[in-house]
């Protein structure tokens, strides 16, 4: 039995997988900030988690996925005030009783130190200093991400 938020997350991920392959992204679009091999878009408005998820999808992106503590710290350094919370692509899976990224992988417990409860209808937000479990219906800002395509050096034959 999947919660409505889990269904929404799966549906959006599946619809993205069905779309035709697009050429790789070499540069970040206007208004997006580059952080290493990603482009990030920090919303200015607020939304519940599932609306934020959908908004990123309409931008051909996803809610932020954080690989490790180092990436978390670099992302937090881009947040300008301590009283701003941003949704990322991590929520509590009731069926699996674990934190689950929207790409289907589970949270490595060492990656993020989450403050708050792991329970139904809990989604993860980040601030300048911390990672919080908040109710998914809370309206806060969110971060979308696009992956940059690594540029490989092409070897051309002599002409």
């Amino acid at each position: 039995q999947k919660s409505s938020i889990e269904k929404c997350s799966v549906d959006i991920q599946q619809s993205r997988n069905k779309t035709t392959e697009r050429p790789g992204l070499l540069n970040c679009p206007i208004y997006w900030q580059q952080l290493r091999e990603k482009c990030l878009l920090f919303s200015h408005t607020v939304n519940p988690w599932n609306n934020s998820l959908a908004d990123c999808s309409t931008k051909e992106s996803s809610l932020l996925l954080i690989r490790d503590k180092d990436e978390l710290i670099h992302t937090q350094n881009l947040i300008r005030d301590k009283a701003i919370l941003f949704w990322i692509g991590l929520n509590f899976s009731l069926s699996e009783k674990n934190w689950k990224w929207i790409n289907g992988s589970f949270l490595n417990s060492n990656d993020l130190e989450i403050r708050g409860d792991a329970k139904e209808n809990s989604c993860i937000s980040i601030s300048q200093t911390s990672v919080y479990s908040e109710y998914c219906s809370t309206e806060i800002r969110w971060i979308c991400q696009k992956e940059l395509t690594p540029v490989r050096n092409k070897v051309y034959p002599d002409s």
Epitope: T45, D81, L85, Y132, Y135, T138, R141
Partner: antibody
């Protein structure tokens, strides 16, 4: 209908303590950040403190940091402000308000409760 | 913190007048500005959020404009119930700060 009702104000001596409460109804309390804003007699509005919906994150004005503690009980739909080491300059009407995380404003306010710090 | 300065601090006007109140931030706050109305002995009421968005239930005679550091609240045709004190507030960064207020009195 959204309602916020403060209680717990009163007369207290300098150095004393007081706990304010704010009973909320008419909305999903746990989904909203909540704040305290105060207004000294005849003066303007001053933000005091904000707490996120889960209670995990809290923020304070420098003037109250280390003396006041904001908290909430989502099972009781109640917001609290524990005020210690009270000073004369803390005398004000204290309002409970919904909102306070950037960029949201305070869209609903309680009627206020008066705190008087005097010997 | 960011300082918010309102002008004038008070004004006298008649019913039907167009009233303009300005608010200036000590640094750019984009459009993170709200306007509140407060009547004596009552709690403040949110009128305008995000500089120009009208809060639900607020009469359309109230409007807000501006971005960056300079903002304006306009009452297109002052009504008897509009005599009150008006405050601007920035939500760009903590501490969240208010202007000192503008008292609108009956001429």
């Amino acid at each position: 209908e959204v309602q916020l009702v403060e209680s717990g104000g009163g007369l207290v001596q300098p150095g004393g303590s007081l706990r304010l409460s704010c009973a909320a109804s008419g909305f999903t309390f746990s989904s909203y950040a909540m704040s305290w804003v105060r207004q000294a007699p005849g003066k303007g509005l001053e933000w005091v403190s904000t707490i996120s919906g889960s209670g995990g994150s809290t923020y304070y004005a420098d003037s109250v940091k280390g003396r006041f503690t904001i908290s909430r009980d989502n099972s009781r739909n109640t917001l609290y402000l524990q005020m210690n080491s009270l000073r004369a300059e803390d005398t004000a009407v204290y309002y409970c308000a919904r909102g306070g995380l950037i960029p949201s404003g305070f869209d609903y306010w309680g009627q206020g409760t008066l705190v008087t710090v005097s010997s | 913190g960011i300082q918010m300065t309102q002008s004038p601090s008070s004004l006298s006007a008649s019913v039907g007048d167009r009233v303009t109140i300005t608010c200036r931030a000590s640094q750019s706050i984009s459009s993170y500005l709200n306007w509140y109305q407060q009547k004596p002995g009552k709690a403040p009421k949110l009128l305008i959020y995000a500089a120009s968005s009208l809060q639900s239930g607020v009469p359309s005679r109230f409007s807000g404009s501006g971005s960056g550091t300079d903002f304006t609240l306009t009452i297109s045709s002052l009504q008897p119930e509009d005599f009150a004190t008006y405050y601007c507030q920035q939500t760009y960064s903590t501490p969240l700060t208010f202007g000192q207020g503008t008292k609108v009195e009956i001429k």
